[in-house]
């Protein structure tokens, strides 16, 4: 039985040109996390494998950085980065847990202040 829950950063608006950290946290389960995939609109951005470490998709290498932790840092944001991001936790023996974060990238005049900085 899958008892775990995923907590996320929550939906975020951020400034064009800035950077943002997307984070998920799996709780309420003793299952072992074997891999975390980060995806956007059916595109794989990055993988963090418990044994092999991080792999960033080649097409995102310039603008995606691993971490902190199992999170993902998106840099040099453009309005085209607006969309839904998925953290997909592969666990044993539970199976797969998915968290969802919607990011809206805005011109600086309407973005929330502080969105370019790291999560406290």
């Amino acid at each position: 039985m899958m008892t775990g829950t995923i907590e996320t950063t929550g939906n975020i608006s951020a400034e064009k040109g800035g950077s943002i950290i997307l984070q998920c946290h799996l709780s309420s389960t003793t299952a072992q996390v074997t891999q975390v995939n980060w995806e956007q609109q059916d595109q794989l951005l990055a993988i963090c494998n418990a044994d092999l470490g991080w792999h960033i998709s080649p097409s995102f290498k310039d603008r995606v950085a691993p971490g902190p932790g199992l999170g993902l840092t998106l840099q040099s944001l453009t309005v085209n980065d607006t969309g839904e991001y998925f953290c997909i936790y592969h666990t044993y023996p539970d199976g797969t847990y998915t968290g969802r974060i919607f990011l809206e990238v805005l011109e600086s005049s309407v973005a929330e202040h502080g969105a370019r900085f790291q999560i406290p």
């Epitope: 950063t9 939906n11 975020i12 969309g83 839904e84 309407v110 969105a115 999560i119």
Partner: antibody, heavy 119, light 112 residues
Framework: EVQLQQSGPELVKPGASMKISCKAS????????MNWVKQSHGKNLEWIGL????????SYNQKFEGKATLTVDKSSSTAYMELLSLTSEDSAVYYC????????????WGQGTSVTVSS | DVVVTQTPLSLPVSFGDQVSISCRSS???????????LSWFLHKPGQSPQLIMY???NRFSGVPDRFSGSGSGTDFTLKISTIKPEDLGMYYC?????????FGGGTKLEIK
């Protein structure tokens, strides 16, 4: 003046599919997210999902994945929602609603499209 | 999904009354940057829903200042200081912090 003009009421048979349109005017269509909302039984509101006109992205309430398909036509400033394999549970009023930048809410709403599923 | 609960379900009022509508969420609506995405709508019969308040306490353009929004975390309130006839209808809160966005069940503001 921002306006969202939706297509007219529909009476459709169970198992059929249909498409609702939402034509935007009075603002730059590609600058704003478009949301879709279902109102059943004259009361409950449910967020179906959204489309992102400037990059073609979508986000769905998982409850409506496989039921609703959201698309946009930038050339005509029109958003569409196709409803698939209709059943009586899909009888409702459907609204399109423009997103407010940076606040994850809706500011302007269409007039609603009534969909009745009946044989 | 985040469950949003509104109370009361029905609120009988007299014109001139001050009223409060409560909205509670099953988890905090504060995102990692301290932003809270909670909005309020009024839905009058035969009309489309209309935005009243967004970001907890920002009044939408054209909304009179007798409307005010407050709250934090999981507990939010919409106050109307002096009820007028045009204020009657169904009030809904909406959380947009977590996917999917979810509405409260509604509060019907009606005349006594």
């Amino acid at each position: 003046e921002v306006q969202l003009q939706q297509s007219g009421p529909e009476l459709v048979k169970p198992g059929a599919s249909m498409k609702i349109s939402c034509k935007a005017s009075g603002y730059s269509f590609t600058d704003y997210i478009m949301n879709w909302v279902k109102q059943s039984h004259g009361k409950n509101l449910e967020w179906i999902g959204l489309s992102i006109p400037y990059n073609g992205g979508t986000s769905y309430n998982q409850k409506f994945e496989g039921k609703a398909t959201l698309t946009v036509d930038k050339s005509s400033s029109t958003a569409y929602m196709e409803l698939l394999s209709l059943t009586s549970e899909d009888s409702a009023v459907y609204y399109c609603a423009r997103g407010i930048k940076g606040y994850f809410a809706m500011d302007y709403w269409g007039q609603g499209t009534s969909v009745t599923v009946s044989s | 999904d985040v469950v949003v609960t509104q109370t009361p379900l029905s609120l009988p009022v007299s014109f001139g009354d001050q009223v409060s509508i409560s909205c509670r969420s099953s988890q905090s609506l504060v995102n990692s940057f301290g932003k809270t995405y909670l909005s309020w709508f009024l839905h009058k019969p035969g009309q489309s829903p209309q935005l009243i308040m967004y970001g907890v306490s920002n009044r939408f353009s054209g909304v009179p200042d007798r409307f005010s929004g407050s709250g934090s975390g999981t507990d939010f309130t919409l106050k109307i200081s002096t009820i007028k006839p045009e204020d009657l209808g169904m009030y809904y809160c909406l959380q947009g912090t977590h996917q999917p966005w979810t509405f409260g069940g509604g509060t019907k503001l009606e005349i006594k």
